[in-house]
């Protein structure tokens, strides 16, 4: 069990545990003190106790020494009296810290005492070598406990100067490979640095004396180190592996390393010395093996072979834990070590070697664990772990402590909680205790909840209820026990509306540069926080302050100016402080394809067949099918800037074979294209330029007409540049007259016209044109008919006859023309005809020509749209290209037909009964007019049927109508008559209904002068004519609201003028009906001073 | 008259990378793609890729994808060459050339950019 | 890749004589093939394209033959500033590729 933070008021006493301790070696320098440390924590206090290899020492019995008054610390420091006081303190030491509870144990520190470093007394003697032989100088300095470092150097303290042939090795000894003459020394000085004394000894200086010789002798290489062909070395894991091998040879030997049983790790392999040196950092179990070394020159070489075995000191692979356990639990420390040779592994408890302890005891060990089952306040303890091997010792410490504490629950008490139907809720209830105490819960009625299956406990005391229902709300209560109290708590769960979407955002496939809206609607808990937000592909989207990309408002989302990047999931999030709920939409961006990223040109050498292959690369399709690729080119010199289609080719496929024109210079570029259009072209294609050939086509629209009667313009449409097929092109035109058989005329011209001078009118020639370039003529061309120009018609078409047929259409006819007589091709008649007049009177108007242009096939013609009862004028001529004829002249007249449509139809109520009609004759007579037609009938179902009148006067312009129903509205429709019938009818709708009920004064004002006001308004259009009262009213203090006597208007008269009027001043203006009133209004008098004139053209009465 | 003029002799080490120049004058630059080809110590030409001064595009040879950039700037009528993770075996002189109108032909060369890489 | 083999390697001819240079291509490349003449410490020279086509400015005593694979540059009268190396390449298809180079020299 571990103790909460949150169970307080409870003092829980704590085993010993070791804080800080000396390291496992100690070495102390002549001048130094000697420092040991334990500290250790603890409840209650900490006593310490130390041991030095093995038996109980006591410290503060020693002379010298120093204890450190201190709770926590049984450490303490030894200062000498003498050099070598150290020395009689060497030893193992270990520390003990115990309490009521146990003992905790530090690792052991070993003392060493290291003397003030001395080189022992010694002759050295002159080395006498002969020059190119090998030597090495010795150093052997004196053993150190700690590291030290040696340096050659000469009587100036100038280091001796080391490369592939002089080298210090590991040892310090001095090795030269080969000796020069310029080695030739007396003071070559071994230097050892002590680092922890700080302080630097030197051997006696060696002379080394080089004899000169003439002739140096190459000999192959020697190992000067190691000496053997092989040696066996233990590398331990972790740490650096160092590997050494100095030869002697002349010419001087260089070192190769070598791995036969692997790859040499180069991450973690450095060469130093000239090579001579290999390091290998952090030795790992895969560096067991063999390492070569092999010194070579020009005579040989020499190998070691060193044989690593990787070892390695104990280390954890799961360390014991402390830990702290209720009664009846069972207690398990692990102590699982690995190291090679495989650790020997002790177990102590409170110090103790389990073996020196009574058999009786609750524990076992089994496989690397030690074990207590059902353990009490008394198995209390602190036990000791250690693994040794001969590369090291590990020891952890680690305690069994056996609480036993009274039933607490560490949730506050009347907590609420609030979750949404549906959902999970979890109720709180952490209890803690030693034993671990037993948490239940009840509902209100102290009835245990777990009959629902949809509540479960959990092992750390919270209940789970899910599917949660709207009567779940309520009161819960926790019990948690154990065997030494028990205490409840209530929880209050308050169950809310889930929030749902209810209309989520719909996914959709939209066009690039277009916007697309999502909405989403929610319904959320009335007294819940509710919030909509929108997520782009996982990422929070939000209106950007510097950019109208992304619009949000009331559940709507708008993307403006979508782009393919813009393509993913969308989804509407609807949360509450309780839940969060997502409706997912996809959005596919398409449009017209992406840009072909690549273009090539293969297939050169059918540019001699002008032909070329072009591949390209798939352009992005954007969520449609490429439906075909576009090829087009230009021609930079031709026509820059200018691309024409060379064809194109399934969406499948990315190469295709391009038939060409020679002598084009093509530059290539492909489109994609879909249904949304075509996408960006690729980048343009190398120019490629198709040999020159003769030309493979002629001109075509070859024509010969005159422009003028004695010669003949021969044209044709000039071939287009890209069939040239060379760099130029010129034309070889060749005629004669048709059929005579003859021999050709012909000119080479480069314009695209000939003119052919002096021929006779209007003669038919053969004609062929050619195109020719460098290389050759184009194709035999075809004979084309032209003619020599021509001359006006002198043919006059004779008229066969007119016929009528109907007021306003005739059917012209004549003969055709002698063809002879034409001049030049017949092209068609021209046919002009105007009106002269009407039959009833002649009109001096402007008079406005009307044309028929009529195909030479033709020899009639129908003129329609004719005024009736009219005369016409009529000329018909014959056309060519030059121009018209003479022409064949006619008049004809139209027969009556039925008028047009009289003007302005009014209806003017008389009296709740009748009403006067009146109107304008049409404008278009037709014939003559004999009278009007006048039909009426009621517009609701339930009236009489339609009544007519014939109104025999043509002069008559108003008519009455009486009898009519004040109830109902009715259509009225009038028609003028001729001969040939009624015309076209004029409708209007009305009745006595509307009009003759109250009054309606329309659009009424009323304007004044100094001493007069004039009132108008508008009469309806129909309203029957009544009489009414206007009264005007003069307003204010002085004034008396004196009134003038009320007048007697007609509503007909649109206007009434009231004289006698005060100057200045406001008058109110009623108007009554039958004694109602009906309408006011106000008016104010200008003041004195101006002319005291009515406007003119009102009426008064 | 057309000139092609490219930069002087480099010496560079293993891994590191060149970049030649290629001035063009006497014509205009645009309407010519420049192509680039070198010639290593007593061996014969090897094309590298070009370069369209007008869009830019520029295409190489499988051999040297990755490797090399070849680059352009119209306001200088200037060409560039880079080639990227020198090894020994790049050692060459590399040329300009423009390429002839209508065909993939090397009509005017530039003098030649001795490189070598060298550690 | 088309590969273009040149042979032989190098000639010497003296002045007057007629000298053949022949280059083979791996493939069929009709006869889009140009030859460069690349004279010491200077740069390549075009002298013939599309297999028989001599560049303007080349000597007539010059001339190329061939197509689909197997070309042929005659120099018909060898004179001394025709000392140079020769090369073929073809421009059917990419990558372009040159032949080894023939070396001309003077006996």
């Known amino acids: 069990i571990q103790i909460p933070e949150e169970y307080e008021g409870h003092h829980v006493m704590e085993p010993p545990v070791i804080t800080e301790q000396s390291p496992r070696r100690l070495v102390v320098f002549p001048t130094d003190d000697i420092s040991l440390k334990c500290e250790a924590s603890g409840k209650p206090e900490v006593q310490f106790r130390w041991t030095r290899d093995g038996v109980h020492f006591k410290p503060k019995e020693e002379l010298g020494v120093t204890v450190y008054q201190s709770p926590h610390s049984g450490s303490f420091t030894i200062t000498g009296n003498n050099s070598n006081f150290a020395q009689r303190f060497q030893g193992i030491y270990r520390c003990f810290a115990s309490n009521k509870l146990g003992t905790a144990m530090s690792h052991e520190i070993r003392l060493m005492a290291e003397g003030a470093p001395k080189w022992p007394k010694e002759t050295v003697k002159p080395v006498e070598v002969e020059e190119g032989e090998s030597v090495v100088l010795p150093c052997n300095p004196p053993p150190s406990a700690e590291p030290l470092r040696i340096y050659w150097m000469n009587s100036k303290i100038l280091h001796i100067k080391q490369d592939e042939r002089v080298t210090m090795g590991q040892n310090g000894n001095l090795y030269f490979a080969n000796v020069l003459t310029s080695d030739n020394h007396s003071d070559y000085i071994c230097h050892a640095h002590f680092p922890g004394t700080r302080t630097i000894i030197q051997k006696e200086p060696i002379d080394l004396r080089v004899k000169a010789t003439n002739s140096m002798i190459d000999r192959k290489p020697r190992l000067l180190f190691p000496t053997n062909s092989s040696s066996h070395l233990v590398a331990l894991q972790g740490q650096p592996l160092v590997l050494e091998c100095i030869a002697e040879g002349f010419p001087t030997p260089t070192i190769k390393w070598l791995r036969p049983s692997g790859p040499m790790p180069a991450d973690r392999v450095t060469y130093q010395n000239h090579n001579k040196t290999l390091q290998l950092l952090k030795v790992g179990e895969e560096d067991d093996g063999e390492y070569r070394c092999l010194a070579e020159n020009s005579l040989g070489s020499a190998r070691h072979a060193y044989y690593v075995t990787v070892e390695a000191a104990p280390y954890w692979l799961h360390k014991p834990q402390s830990h702290l356990y209720g009664p009846g639990e069972t207690a398990r420390l692990d102590c699982q070590v690995q190291g090679r040779p495989q650790p020997e592994v002790t177990w102590r408890i409170n110090g103790i070697p389990v073996e020196e302890l009574a058999k009786d005891q609750k524990y076992r060990i089994q496989r690397g664990a030690l074990i207590l089952s059902n353990v009490q306040p008394s198995d209390t303890m602190v036990t000791q772990c250690e693994a040794r091997n001969r590369h090291g010792l590990l020891l952890a410490n680690a305690y069994i402590y056996v609480v036993q504490l009274p039933a607490k629950i560490l949730t506050a008490d009347n907590q609420t909680y609030m979750a949404v139907q549906g959902s999970t809720a979890y109720l709180l209830c952490k209890a803690f205790g030693a034993p671990v105490p037993s948490v239940q819960w009840l509902d209100e009625d102290g009835t245990t909840v777990l009959q629902d299956e949809r509540f479960f406990p959990y092992a750390n005391g919270t209940l789970g209820i899910r599917d949660l229902q709207a009567n779940d709300t309520g009161r819960y209560f926790c019990l948690a026990a154990n065997d030494q109290n028990n205490v409840t708590i209530m929880a209050n769960l308050k169950v809310k509306d889930a929030t749902q979407i209810t209309q989520g955002p719909r996914s959709t496939i939209e066009k690039k540069g277009s916007r697309v809206t999502f909405t989403c609607q929610a319904s959320f808990d009335p007294s819940l926080q509710p919030s909509i937000t929108w997520r782009g592909d996982g990422r929070d989207l939000q209106e950007l302050g510097d950019s109208d990309k992304y619009f949000i408002e009331d559940g709507r989302l708008v993307i403006h100016s979508l782009d393919y990047s813009d393509q993913g999931n969308y989804s509407c999030v609807a949360s509450t402080e309780l839940d969060v709920v997502e409706s997912r939409a996809q959005l596919l961006v398409v449009g017209s394809p992406g840009p072909v990223p690549r273009l090539v040109l293969s297939d050169l050498h059918l540019l001699t067949q002008s032909q070329v292959r072009v591949s390209w690369s798939p352009a992005e399709d954007h969520n449609a099918p490429i439906e075909k690729y576009d090829i087009e080119f230009e021609d930079k010199e031709m026509a820059p800037e200018k691309w024409y289609s060379l064809g194109k080719v399934p969406g499948n496929q990315t190469s295709t074979t391009l038939k060409l024109s020679p002598y084009v210079h093509y530059t290539f570029r492909v489109t994609a294209i879909n249904k949304y259009g075509p996408g960006e072209p690729s980048p343009v294609s190398e120019t490629v330029v198709t040999p020159e050939a003769a030309p493979e086509k002629n001109p075509v629209d070859v024509k010969g007409e005159g422009n003028e009667t004695t010669n003949m313009v021969i044209t044709w449409k000039p071939l287009r540049w890209m069939d040239w097929n060379a760099p130029q092109v010129q034309y070889r035109v060749q005629w004669r007259p048709q059929g005579t058989r003859g021999p050709w005329q012909e000119q080479i011209v480069s314009d695209p016209f000939l003119v052919v001078s002096n021929t006779s009118t209007f003669v038919p020639y053969e004609i062929k044109v050619q195109a020719v370039n460098s290389q050759g003529k184009g194709p035999e061309p075809q004979v084309t008919i032209g003619y020599s120009g021509e001359d006006y018609p002198q043919a006059i078409p004779e008229l066969e006859g007119i016929e009528i047929l109907n007021s306003s259409a005739v059917l012209v006819k004549w003969r055709p023309v002698d063809l002879a007589q034409v001049k030049g091709h017949l092209r068609g008649y021209n046919v002009t005809y105007w009106r002269e007049g009407s039959q009833r009177k002649h009109s001096k108007r402007h008079i406005h020509k009307d044309h028929v242009v009529v195909p030479a096939n033709t020899t009639s013609v129908i003129l329609s749209g004719l005024r009736p009862y009219s005369s016409y004028h009529l000329e018909v001529q014959a056309f060519n290209g030059r121009g018209s004829g003479p022409a064949s002249e006619f008049t004809f007249s139209t027969p009556e037909g039925v008028p047009g449509h009289p003007e302005a139809l009014h209806l003017e109520c008389q009296s709740n009964t009748s009403l006067l009609l009146r109107w304008q004759p049409p404008l278009s007579h037709n014939g003559v007019l004999t009278g009007y037609v006048l039909s009426y009938h009621p517009l609701d179902e339930g009236g009489k049927g339609q009544l007519s009148f014939n109104l025999r006067d043509p002069e008559l312009r108003t008519h009455n109508l009486t009898d009519l129903s004040p109830h109902l509205r009715y259509r009225f429709q009038l028609q003028a008559t001729t001969k040939e019938g009624p015309g076209e009818a004029i409708v209007r709708e009305g009745g006595t209904m509307a009009l003759s009920g109250i009054s309606d004064f329309g659009n009424i004002s009323a304007t004044a002068g100094e001493n007069y006001s004039v009132v108008s308004w508008v009469p309806k259009e129909g309203q029957c004519n009544f009489r009414f009262h206007i009264l005007f009213k003069a307003l204010g203090e002085e004034k008396g609201g004196a009134s003038l006597s009320p007048q007697y208007v007609s509503y007909n008269q649109s206007s009434y003028t009231q004289w006698d009027l005060q100057p200045d001043t406001d008058y109110e203006i009623h108007l009554f009906k039958e004694r109602m009133f009906r309408h006011q209004m106000a008016v104010k008098t200008n003041g004195t001073g101006r002319v005291r004139l009515p406007p003119a053209g009102f009426a008064t009465e | 008259q057309v000139q092609l003029v490219q930069s002087g002799a480099e010496v560079k080490k293993p891994g590191s990378s060149v970049k030649v120049s290629c001035k063009a004058s006497?014509?205009?630059?645009?309407?010519?793609?420049i192509q680039w080809v070198r010639q290593a110590p007593g061996q014969g030409l090897e094309w590298m890729g070009y370069?369209?001064?007008?869009?830019?595009?520029?295409d190489y040879a499988q051999k040297f994808q990755g490797r090399v950039t070849i680059t352009a700037d119209e306001s200088t009528s200037t060409a560039y060459m880079e080639l990227s993770s020198l090894r020994s075996e790049d050692t060459a002189v590399y040329y300009c050339?423009?390429?002839?109108?209508?065909?993939?032909?090397?009509?005017?060369w530039g003098q030649g950019t001795t490189v070598t890489v060298s550690s | 890749d088309i590969q273009m083999t040149q042979s032989p390697s190098s000639l010497s001819a003296s002045v007057g004589d007629r000298v053949t240079i022949t280059c083979r291509a791996s493939?069929?490349?009709?006869?889009?093939v140009a030859w460069y003449q690349q004279k010491p410490g200077k740069v390549p020279k075009l002298l013939i394209y599309w297999a028989s086509t001599l560049h303007s400015g080349v000597p007539s005593r010059f001339s190329g033959s061939g197509s689909g694979t197997d070309f042929t540059l005659t120099i018909s009268s060898l004179q001394p500033e025709d000392v140079a190396t020769y090369f073929c390449?073809?421009?059917?298809?990419?990558?372009?590729?040159f032949g080894g180079g023939t070396k001309v020299e003077i006996k």
């Open positions: 370069i369209n001064p007008s869009t830019y595009y520029s």
């Open positions: 006497g014509y205009t630059f645009t309407n010519y793609w």
């Open positions: 390449q073809q421009y059917s298809n990419y990558p372009l590729t």
């Open positions: 493939q069929d490349v009709g006869t889009a």
């Open positions: 050339a423009r390429r002839q109108f209508g065909l993939p032909l090397f009509d005017y």
